[in-house]
Amino acid sequence: SAPGEDEECGRVRDFVAKLANNTHQHVFDDLRGSVSLSWVGDSTGVILVLTTFHVPLVIMTFGQSKLYRSEDYGKNFKDITDLINNTFIRTEFGMAIGPENSGKVVLTAEVSGGSRGGRIFRSSDFAKNFVQTDLPFHPLTQMMYSPQNSDYLLALSTENGLWVSKNFGGKWEEIHKAVCLAKWGSDNTIFFTTYANGSCKADLGALELWRTSDLGKSFKTIGVKIYSFGLGGRFLFASVMADKDTTRRIHVSTDQGDTWSMAQLPSVGQEQFYSILAANDDMVFMHVDEPGDTGFGTIFTSDDRGIVYSKSLDRHLYTTTGGETDFTNVTSLRGVYITSVLSEDNSIQTMITFDQGGRWTHLRKPENSECDATAKNKNECSLHIHASYSISQKLNVPMAPLSEPNAVGIVIAHGSVGDAISVMVPDVYISDDGGYSWTKMLEGPHYYTILDSGGIIVAIEHSSRPINVIKFSTDEGQCWQTYTFTRDPIYFTGLASEPGARSMNISIWGFTESFLTSQWVSYTIDFKDILERNCEEKDYTIWLAHSTDPEDYEDGCILGYKEQFLRLRKSSVCQNGRDYVVTKQPSICLCSLEDFLCDFGYYRPENDSKCVEQPELKGHDLEFCLYGREEHLTTNGYRKIPGDKCQGGVNPVREVKDLKKKCTSNFLSPEKQNSKSN
């Protein structure tokens, strides 16, 4: 029988009345245009909604916008457009919400053609009040907050100036001209690239990378011949043009650009690209595009310095620069990532890793599913997940995979069961163990969200027709109840719940199908009365993550340690609550070869845990470039996986000797760098 229709599915008692009492409709006095929604702060209940409406006139488009504010998680909204003097707000800049709980908001206004500069509206009290500020420049990008100090803002102007404010946008100073890209680093540092000759495009590959640690009083050039740069975790990456040809290489710094090392990654040509797929303080996943217009490349995983890389996954699907990749960090379980590969026959298959890229495998076929037409063998096939690429290809996939750090083990995604991703209408699948096993959760495409740290899952069917029904589950997607939240169906445009999945409120957004005027409408449903009581100790059960063989003493060991979690029993209908903290008990494991990556010059043959020398390097001294010096590596082929905490057990030898020789391949050594003060 279909999910949710089993006899053992216990119904939540009297849920219709409970939800009806907690369903709040708000019709916006607005013609349908576009709507954007932002949460201001964490657990504040404050939501800002900006509606914009463009009326096509004969020679131009007339725009108007309205700003609404809720302070009760979307149950009620107040029109606060007058606080911004009824000004038209530019949606392409969005609402710039300050970090953490700063309560800061910046809105960028549309100004008339001949004006000297742009205009912003600033709030530092969770949008209760706004101050209008006229800018001495026209912004090209949204205001960017320093992660460390929300009073510090930076923006690029349409004339490529880098502007900084130290008092939350009250006063602005142009600290540099001819800037292409600027990013905040740690400790209020700003990194930016500059061009010398014509423009950012013309100088691509000849840009300079600069740093200021004092908001523009002084500068240091930390890189030349730069193509682009990026920040990930504690790593600063720059792709740098080679001296002799048009190829580029990645260089890495872990000290804000003072010293650089060349990453042991393949160089790329003009039509290729590098992409940081994921990064944390331990390591980085780097995609290196294949030559030619193949649509795939190779994933490499780094060591703890971001320098030595191991090949992690071949034929990784990534269409073009800034294109689509399905690479997804499963945030509900440590070490788990999902992505797609392009097979030799051009079909797309999903792969999963449970050990941070150490090894990849297909997703296990859900027990309650049949193999589809793509499967050669009807008894052997895998689950394939639809993500960004499928969405970009306009397949019937309304949402990317979903996981939340505080909903341990839960992953929800659209997928198909076969030998490859299917273009047929997908179903929704759920894993409750971080991707090891899967179950079909809902028939057909749906929007979905996680509430109360996994205590409730909410879904809405994806349909081109107006809808008025929401589905919810209190047992991690096994059984579903349906609730008709409005008599008059609406064209559904999105589900909104507070980021972090701790809330019990869900807002359903859409617009009315009307004989008069179509209007924006939101229905906010509070599930607090469905989960009547707070969860107690008896509602939780112990769960060992990454468990595949309970008989094995090392069962659950991933990256050198295992973790036991307290997880809500599926049968318990209770509130985890806003203050819920994931309870986990880690224990260190003995080291095995699985805790080591293959070192520079070594690789792991398929289905083998041993690292063997790359044939082309056999018998050669292993030398590589580090901090501008040449190093000699003595290794038996292994290095510990970044973040791996294992102790004892297997302990391969690894030693690095400084050869005291300069690297000719390195693009910058410390003495070449120059500083400059304003």
């Epitope: 349908r32 096509p56 064209y491 199908e513 004989f515 008069l516 005027t517 179509s518």
Partner: antibody, heavy 117, light 112 residues
């Protein structure tokens, strides 16, 4: 500026069929409900058909139900009225109208339909 | 069907003088959503009808404020404080609360 231009009116025999069109411009067509209203030769106004913003819902008075069909193509910004089984009492000028917070906010200039043997 | 009865059928006025037209419905026009869907339209000679007032008393954009609409339930009135030449034509009331939507027979405003 809201602009509604009707076309397709003609002289037709009783029992015959006709399709009227209304091309809309100067506003976002897909947001608004639309109606056809006819004015009879004795200058009385009669509402004939109505369609919701997305084209999901339609309404008709009993006098035309089953004979007239209102439709819209939001991609083409066009409203239609398919008329069949026409009777002499269907004679009149057919106006396309746009709604807003209430009915019949804007009117087209009309197209003349004459049902006569 | 809701019958809309307009009086008078013809109103002869002098430019600069006030004018008043009444419209009565056979049922209350108060909708369940709290709104009353009563419109007033003007059709000038040789032109299409044009809406002047909606929801009993709201003036459409560009309509001079010498026009006012009032009433509730089943009784509604359109007033012109000082008639001008451009106000001449046929005035229709119409209701949109109940299907089918219905119109009054019209009141012709003409010069004395």
């Amino acid at each position: 500026e809201v602009h509604l231009v009707e076309s397709g009116g003609d002289l037709v025999n009783p029992g015959g069929s006709l399709k009227l069109s209304c091309e809309a411009s100067g506003f976002i067509f897909s947001i608004y409900g639309m109606s056809w209203v006819r004015q009879t030769p004795d200058k009385r106004l009669e509402w004939v058909a109505m369609i919701s913003s997305g084209g999901i819902y339609t309404q008709y008075p009993d006098s035309v139900k089953g004979r007239f069909t209102i439709s819209r193509d939001n991609a083409k910004n066009t409203l239609y009225l398919q008329m069949s089984g026409l009777k002499s009492e269907d004679t009149g000028t057919y106006h396309c109208t746009r709604h807003d917070d209430s009915w019949f906010a804007y009117w087209g200039q009309g197209t003349l339909v004459t049902v006569s043997a | 069907d809701v019958v809309m009865t307009q009086t008078p059928l013809t109103l002869s006025v002098t430019i600069g003088q006030p004018a008043s037209i009444s419209c009565k419905s056979s049922q209350s026009l108060l909708d369940s959503n709290g709104k009353t869907y009563l419109n007033w339209l003007l059709q000038r000679p040789g032109q299409s009808p044009k809406r002047l007032i909606y929801l009993v008393s709201k003036l459409d954009s560009g309509v001079p404020d010498r026009f006012t609409g009032s009433g509730s339930g089943t009784d509604f009135t359109l007033r012109i404080s000082r008639v001008e030449a451009e106000d001449l034509g046929v005035y229709y009331c119409c209701q949109g609360t109940h299907f089918p939507l219905t119109f009054g027979a019209g009141t012709k405003l003409e010069l004395k």
